[in-house]
């Protein structure tokens, strides 16, 4: 049992599912990254609480022409209860600092990380 | 050592209550979501019911709706309460701490408690 990968299918649909599909497409975005990821773009740092994830898709919005993300940000859009275009910021309450498209994934994946930890699917 | 040890399993007639209960040991339990699993005879594993770490946020497989999951951190406690049980809640039911590996959503689970129920 220490080495469950699914559950029996058919079956109830565990809650971490959407979770883990960011984390594992954020995983994989750190792992296959050669050259610097979306050019070395710059996006900015958000505060990761609550309302995080509309937050980070807003931010990540704002890169355009870097297939790497794009995955990432239709699966964010899930976790996103409302629309987000680009250059909107009302999730983004702080915006003082700017890091590389690279540094904010691997950030926000460790907090993913926590959260699954945590149980907190929602 | 991270230990999971649960109890409260038994043989119960349907309409009939249990409550189960997962004494963890061995890491700090408030810091951690949990989860209740179970494997009914001759087949897979089946999620049960989530708690976060902190007993804010519970999920359920509607399968299983008017069953209620709850946490004891100052017990290092994890609870199913199970009412009106049927014949097809018949199955062993494992808790489990939440680990995000690329395999698994579990790192740790427990030997087991058998609910049968019977008339």
């Known amino acids: 049992l220490t080495c469950l990968g699914g559950f029996a299918s058919p079956g109830p649909v565990p809650p971490s599912t959407a979770l883990r599909e960011l984390i594992e497409e954020l995983v994989n975005i750190t792992q296959n990254q050669k050259a610097p990821l979306c050019n070395g773009s710059m996006v900015w740092s958000i505060n990761l609480t609550a309302g995080m994830y509309c937050a980070a898709l807003e931010s990540l919005i704002n890169v355009s022409g870097c297939s790497a993300i794009e995955k990432t940000q239709r699966m964010l859009s899930g976790f996103c209860p409302h629309k987000v275009s680009a250059g909107q910021f009302s999730s983004l309450h702080v915006r003082d600092t700017k890091i590389e498209v690279a540094q904010f994934v691997k950030d926000l994946l460790l907090h993913l990380k926590k959260l699954f930890r945590e149980g907190q699917f929602n | 050592e991270v230990q999971l040890l649960e109890s409260g399993g038994g043989l119960v007639q349907p309409g009939g209550s249990l409550r189960l209960s997962c004494a963890a040991s061995?890491?700090?339990?408030?810091?951690?979501?949990m989860a209740w699993v179970r494997q009914a005879p001759g087949k897979g594993l089946e999620w049960v019911s989530t708690?976060?770490?902190?007993?804010?946020?519970t999920y359920y497989a509607d399968s299983v709706k008017g069953r209620t999951i709850s946490r004891d951190n100052s017990k290092n406690t994890l609870y199913l309460q199970m009412n009106s049980l049927r014949a097809e809640d018949t199955a062993v039911y494992y808790c489990?701490?939440?680990?995000?590996?690329?395999?698994?959503?579990?790192?740790?689970w427990g030997q087991g408690t058998l609910v049968t129920v019977s008339s």
């Open positions: 061995g890491f700090t339990f408030a810091d951690y979501g």
């Open positions: 708690i976060s770490y902190n007993g804010l946020y």
């Open positions: 489990a701490k939440y680990e995000y590996s690329p395999e698994s959503d579990f790192d740790y």
